[in-house]
């Protein structure tokens, strides 16, 4: 059992609204119907998360791009690494929710 | 647009199943009636991620503790600092799926 | 950092059997396979069998299916190969190595090796 | 199994040499070609995978090619550090087999 307090302006700090690293399931419906498997069968990006000071706030990527990744392709009759590409957040604010 | 291509290897490094950190809302449920509002309304913490090698193996925690944090607590008539406990994994392992 | 380390020597008598161990840290063992390498005194590389600490599969190459058995200890983040009825043709240097993935195999980080001497 | 050959078995080169190592296959491998270094002490690193993706960490002047059965390492610039001894393996099929590996001496 853990004794020590992470204190408040830590916590705080932490869950703030920014890119942070995120898993992310692949979807083999991308990939047609060759594909029989993706290896990894997820990959990490740095996407927005975290909390806003506020509960009318919602936490938004304001700064985006694609990022581009090598991923195996098990197929038939042969398999290869081919290449993804996904969304990663650069930026990121706490904006006021839609209505 | 990103020109560089992330190395497999790279990228499986990265998904593969460990702690990582992990954003958590944080429910008022567990708090009672008193308190209107918690800051801030989510935290971090370690918890297992990512996937395995192998489709029949899943990622699941074998080592896990308890980490106390600060939390602002919004009530009436006085607002304090409290402390809130969450689950963190410290060690993680690919498990075969029950079936 | 990923790690695998393995003892430095082992020293055999003919017809007897040993234990290598290889033990990992810095990364998830079960998220990896375990493979055995063998090079015999200025010789080339030899795939001996891999093994997966997850579930405990293993592959063995046909050539090393009698002699050798893999097995991991999960709790120790450790793989074991255990190598039966040796002779002097199996006095070598055996390596462990990881990898992800059963397809590519390309394995990224190797253990030291293990130099096995077998003599009477 | 598939038989992996480094016709090659030792080449001697200069210091700012560009040295290239041949790796042939007993059949189409589809670039599931991987090579290694060993060092004179025995430490083994991965350099290249699928032919020609660097693995981190290591520099730059390595490179791979090739298609098929016919794989190629390339260091452009040779530097005393690159002494050692380098394999290929192919990694198509099981089991995974090495080439006889190429010494790397200099001149």
């Known amino acids: 059992h853990q004794k020590k307090v992470v204190p408040w302006i830590d916590v705080y700090a932490r869950a703030t609204c920014q890119p942070r690293e995120v898993v992310v399931p692949l979807s083999m419906e991308l990939m047609g119907n060759v594909v029989k498997q993706l290896v990894p069968s997820c990959v990490t990006v740095q996407r927005c998360g975290g909390c806003c000071p506020d509960d009318g706030l919602e936490c938004v990527p304001t700064g985006q791009h694609q990022v581009r990744m090598q991923i195996l392709m098990i197929q038939y009759p042969s398999s290869q690494l081919g290449e993804m590409s996904l969304e990663e957040h650069s930026q990121c604010e706490c904006r006021p929710k839609k209505k | 647009h990103q020109k560089k291509v992330v190395p497999w290897i790279d990228v499986y490094a990265r998904a593969t199943c460990q702690p990582r950190e992990v954003v958590v809302p944080l429910s008022m449920e567990l708090m009672g009636n008193v308190v209107k509002q918690l800051v801030p309304s989510c935290v971090t913490v370690q918890r297992c991620g990512g996937c395995c090698p192998d489709d029949g193996l899943e990622c699941v925690p074998t080592g896990q503790h308890q980490v106390r944090m600060q939390i602002l607590m919004i009530q009436y008539p006085s607002s304090q600092l409290g402390e809130m406990s969450l689950e963190e994994h410290s060690q993680c392992e690919c498990r075969p799926k029950k079936k | 950092q990923v790690q695998l380390q393995q003892p430095g020597t082992e020293l055999v008598k003919p017809g007897a059997s040993v234990k290598l161990s290889c033990k990992a840290s810095?990364?998830?063992?079960?998220?990896?396979?375990i493979h055995w390498v063998k090079q015999r005194p200025g010789q080339g590389l030899e795939w001996i069998g891999h093994?997966?600490?997850?579930?405990?599969?293993?592959n063995y190459n046909e050539k090393f299916k009698r002699m050798a058995t893999l097995t991991v200890d999960k709790s120790s983040s450790t793989a074991y190969m255990q190598l039966s009825s040796l002779t002097s043709e199996d006095s070598a240097v055996y390596y462990c190595?990881?990898?992800?993935?059963?397809?590519?195999?390309?394995?990224?980080?190797w253990g030291q090796g293990t130099s096995v001497t077998v003599s009477s | 199994e598939i038989q992996m050959t480094q016709t090659t078995s030792s080449l001697s080169a200069s210091l700012g040499d560009r040295v290239t190592i041949s790796c042939r296959a007993s059949?189409?491998?589809?670039?599931?070609l991987n090579w290694y270094q060993q060092k004179p002490d025995g430490t083994v690193k991965l350099l290249i995978y699928?032919?020609?993706t660097l693995h981190s960490g290591v520099p730059s002047r390595f490179s791979g090619s090739g298609s098929g059965t016919d794989y190629s390492l390339t260091i452009s610039n040779l530097e005393q550090e690159d002494i050692a001894t380098y394999f290929c393996?192919?990694?198509?099929?099981?089991?995974?087999?090495f080439g006889g590996g190429t010494k790397l001496e200099i001149k």
């Open positions: 699928y032919t020609s």
């Open positions: 190595a990881r990898s992800y993935s059963n397809y590519v195999r390309a394995m990224d980080y």
């Open positions: 393996q192919q990694g198509k099929t099981l089991p995974p087999t």
């Open positions: 059949q189409d491998i589809s670039n599931f």
């Open positions: 810095g990364y998830t063992f079960t998220g990896f396979w």
């Open positions: 093994i997966n600490p997850g579930n405990g599969g293993t």
